[in-house]
Interface confidence: low
């Protein structure tokens, strides 16, 4: 079964999240500073002409780039696009921001810089005070709080109105921990199977505390050397590991969720191009726990994989999780060939 | 006994660590890039006039701020001050850095941004090429490796010579794990008893993988609302927890050390202002293990606290650890009143 049932579709995750229509209340919009009450946080809504027509920070954004507009979405969302405008004010306003940066947080404590797929943080903004410029975020952000940091290349006034577009992050996945993805040397090309959008920490060959390509909604193609994305390197859509590096015979991952959940199914989108060494896992074992300091509970849920492993197409495998309750999962994916390649992991839970 | 015997005194931890006098060898100084061999890493020593008189990076530091000078101290040190100079070169040099940032690491894998007590990273540097500007680091850093990132507000050449000042980190403490400090609501003021300089991670109400105010050498005053530091909030010197949040009746902490040690004593500087709810712990229980994957060994060392608990002065309590050997300690501090407030924890070991 090649599709990811119940998994969010990033193409459909593009709803306005409530700046323009005011479903985001004023109390959830805050700023580092405001030029005046008439350019305060509450005036930062896209297409709004209240007050003096936008949020304008008190001080210059050059050279420090420390002024920000913060939107609290209250719950985790996948933010797929943002829109910006300057201060039009019926033709009286001339201030806008030619570029900006985004930072985001899932918990209000740890903030991450949004970067595009090539590591660039700076986003092209507006060229005039009135027009709306939409930015498709590739990769999207899983965030509760988003900060816009307007930029300028000299001391000048900048003002901003914004909207965010996306959808509720129903998966509830806060972070996954996994070994760092590896590089496959094929005769004609190096295939980089790293998690290139991971937003957590990396230490000792392990990535932890973040989310990345395995939770971005993009499933890989049958040929893992190809990609859904433009201008990226071979292997981009997949994260992969060689059995040579795992004498235990499995890759172990941990998943942390926002709250206690009852887990029905885990869906793992895997490559199976066995002519190049990629195989579906031979089996999956998952354990559960309710809190970070607790022990993994009882016997793991085991799921052996059989069936049409000869079919080289990529597909989603469904791992039944038997209604176990937890906030943390630990899953071991058993090698059945030289490489394990995953492009997406999602969960059906209540 | 109110003093911390055997504990390092930050006022005395201000020795030059070896850039100027060359006890730090050239091989332990590295850089991201150099303008030329005559402005290479080895020319970055304070007051040195070798080569062209300083380290100068190959490219501009504006706007990216990615060029750095790295000093490897080989062993963990408490770094309390840094000194910087520009490129004087007998009056021929004009390049200096008006500001810079510091990053540091204890293991060469994980790097932390140094921040002052108010969260600012940028340090004011030099105003001329020849003068030495000393920066008192508050808080100090426990580091093996230190990186200086010079900054500029426009495209211009910057050059740097440096010294570090501090002392060997004899405690050997690599990190402590503790519940996040809480806020005490007094009638007249909110007292923030968080560990505001902690440089590790925070997750699930727990801080782990770092060091902070409990290992900075600064002991708190009798009145925990007051502070040794200027311009900080009430409660700054203490980390505190309310018994209402700990139904077990204790706060549990873990301590990781650089190597196997034989532990004689743990010293905990505690507040005892019981008119406002702060009390010394009623007892302490500690366990030991030799490796991260091992089980805690045997029965814990127990130390009951008696004596002049009525005396409201802050004091250091000494917990005898009986010569137990380990690289990890787990200690439980038992509540004897509404709040536990600690300002410093140190260890005597060999």
């Amino acid at each position: 079964d090649a599709d990811m049932k119940g998994h969010f579709d990033p193409a459909k995750c593009r709803y306005a999240l409530g700046m323009q229509d005011r479903t985001i209340p004023d109390s959830d919009i805050s700023v580092s500073s405001s030029w005046s009450d008439s350019t305060a946080a509450r005036h930062s809504r896209l297409e709004s002409s209240d007050g003096d027509g936008a949020w304008c920070p008190a001080g210059p954004v050059f050279p420090k780039e420390e002024e920000y507009l913060q939107v609290d979405l209250r719950r985790l969302h996948l933010v797929a696009l943002v829109g910006t405008q300057g201060r039009h004010a019926g033709g009286l306003g001339k201030e806008f921001s030619r570029s900006y940066r985004l930072r985001y947080s899932r918990d209000g404590r740890r903030w991450m810089d949004w970067k595009d797929r090539w590591g660039q943080e700076v986003i092209s903004g507006n060229e005039d005070p009135g027009g709306v410029v939409l930015k498709d975020l590739g990769p999207p952000m899983v965030a509760r709080l988003v900060r816009f940091y307007p930029r300028a290349d000299r001391v000048m006034s900048v003002c901003l109105r914004v909207e965010l577009y996306g959808c509720l992050w129903r998966d509830g996945l806060l972070s996954y921990t996994a070994p760092v993805g590896q590089t496959m040397q094929l005769s004609e090309v190096m295939v980089h199977l790293n998690d290139s959008t991971y937003d957590g920490y990396t230490a000792g060959g392990l990535q932890y505390g973040g989310l990345g390509q395995l939770a971005d909604g993009v499933v890989g193609l049958d040929d893992f050397r190809q990609s859904q994305e433009l201008r990226v390197w071979p292997g981009y859509d997949y994260v992969g590991w060689s059995n040579q590096s795992f004498p235990t015979g499995y890759v172990e991952m941990e998943f942390e969720f926002d709250r206690l959940r009852t887990f029905q199914t885990m869906q793992v989108h895997c490559n199976n191009m066995h002519t190049l060494g990629a195989r579906l896992p031979g089996g999956v074992e998952c354990r559960f726990k309710r809190g970070p300091a607790m022990a993994w509970e009882g016997e793991p849920v085991r799921h052996a994989l059989g069936g049409s492993l000869g079919d080289p197409r990529a597909r989603a495998i469904s791992v039944p999780l038997g209604g176990h309750v937890g906030r943390f999962l630990q899953c071991r994916f058993l090698f059945a060939g030289p490489w394990l390649l995953f492009s997406e992991i999602s969960f059906i839970s209540d | 006994d109110a003093d911390m015997k055997g504990h390092f005194d930050p006022a005395k931890c201000r020795y030059a660590l070896g850039m100027q006098d060359r006890t730090i060898p050239d091989s332990d100084i590295s850089v991201s890039s150099s303008w030329s061999d005559s402005t290479a890493a080895r020319h970055s020593r304070l007051e040195s006039s070798d080569g062209d008189g300083a380290w100068c990076p190959a490219g501009p530091v504006f706007p990216k701020e990615e060029e750095y000078l790295q000093v490897d101290l080989r062993r963990l040190h408490l770094v309390a001050l840094v000194g910087t100079q520009g490129r004087h070169a007998g009056g021929l040099g004009k390049e200096f850095s008006r500001s810079y940032r510091l990053r540091y690491s204890r293991d060469g894998r994980r790097w932390m941004d140094w921040k002052d007590r108010w969260g600012q990273e940028v340090i004011s540097g030099n105003e001329d090429p020849g003068g030495v500007v000393l920066k008192d680091l508050g808080p100090p850093m426990v580091a093996r490796l230190v990186r200086f990132y010079p900054r500029a507000d426009r495209v211009m050449s910057v050059c740097l010579r440096v010294e570090l000042y501090g002392c060997l980190w004899r405690d050997g403490l690599l990190s402590y794990t503790a519940p996040v400090g809480q806020t005490m609501q007094l009638s007249e003021v909110m007292v923030h008893l968080n560990d505001s300089t902690y440089d590790g991670y925070t997750a699930g109400g727990l801080q782990y993988g770092g060091l902070g105010q409990l290992a900075d050498g600064v002991v708190g005053l009798d009145d925990f609302r007051q502070s040794q530091e200027l311009r900080v909030w009430p409660g700054y010197d203490y980390v505190g927890w309310s018994n209402q949040s700990f139904p077990t009746g204790y706060v549990e902490m873990e301590f990781e050390f650089d190597r196997l040690r034989t532990f004689q004593t743990m010293q905990v500087h505690c507040n005892n202002m019981h008119t406002l709810g702060a009390r010394l712990p009623g007892g302490v229980e500690c366990r030991f293990k030799r490796g991260p994957a091992m089980a805690w060994e045997g029965e814990p060392v127990r130390h009951a606290l008696g004596g002049s608990l009525g005396d409201p002065r802050a004091r250091a309590i000494s917990v005898p650890l009986g010569g137990h050997v380990g690289r990890f300690l787990q200690c439980r501090f038992l509540f004897a009143g509404p709040w536990l407030l600690f300002s410093e924890i140190s260890f005597i070991s060999d």
Epitope: - | L260, G291, M294
Partner: antibody
Framework: QVQLKQSGPGLVQPSQSLSITCTVS????????IHWVRQSPGKGLEWLGV???????DYNAAFISRLSISMDSSKGQVFFKMNSLQANDTAIYYC???????????????WGQGTSVTVSS | SIVMTQTPKFLLVSAGDRVTITCKAS??????VAWYQQKPGQSPKLLIY???NRYTGVPDRFTGSGYGTDFTFTINTVQAEDLAVYFC?????????FGAGTKLELK
Amino acid sequence: QVQLKQSGPGLVQPSQSLSITCTVSGFSFTGYGIHWVRQSPGKGLEWLGVIWSGGITDYNAAFISRLSISMDSSKGQVFFKMNSLQANDTAIYYCARRSTTVVADYAMDYWGQGTSVTVSS
Amino acid sequence: SIVMTQTPKFLLVSAGDRVTITCKASQSVSNDVAWYQQKPGQSPKLLIYYASNRYTGVPDRFTGSGYGTDFTFTINTVQAEDLAVYFCQQDYTSPLTFGAGTKLELK
């Protein structure tokens, strides 16, 4: 080079004590533990206890009541004493070292030559 | 205490054979497992520590793997000098415990 040399009696009377000395050379005690292990045809290899570089001991609970390990670090000697021996304590007794430093945390990498002990009247 | 169940007890081998010995711990011991070789009249010699790390000077035909409860020791191409008894040992928690041993004998 690293060496552990054992000296002690080959024959012990039932209910008597066994004393073995392990003299080490080629390394200092700091950063090492000296373990004691015995081997008998019936029970295979059994770990008895260890003394760490600070003189701290750790015993197998099954032997704790009759086992004592001590050291004289100035002489590079570790002393093993087991009381109340019975016939089923007949075995070869070994000392072995184990590093405790994080950078070289191996298992028991050097062993003594063994002391063959028979408990018999 | 943790029981280390080692199989098989005996292996009849010829030079050039590939040999696999397994050790199963009664509870998880992380990767804190060592493998030793003992020849008649000699003390045990360390071959593998932390489940998969070859000790200094040990030929690369000896390999170890495993984590948690299941561990494997392999000799890729057996040579005459490899005839000996092999033991696994857990170093995870006190008391340290050993497997019963596997004796390699010539066919």
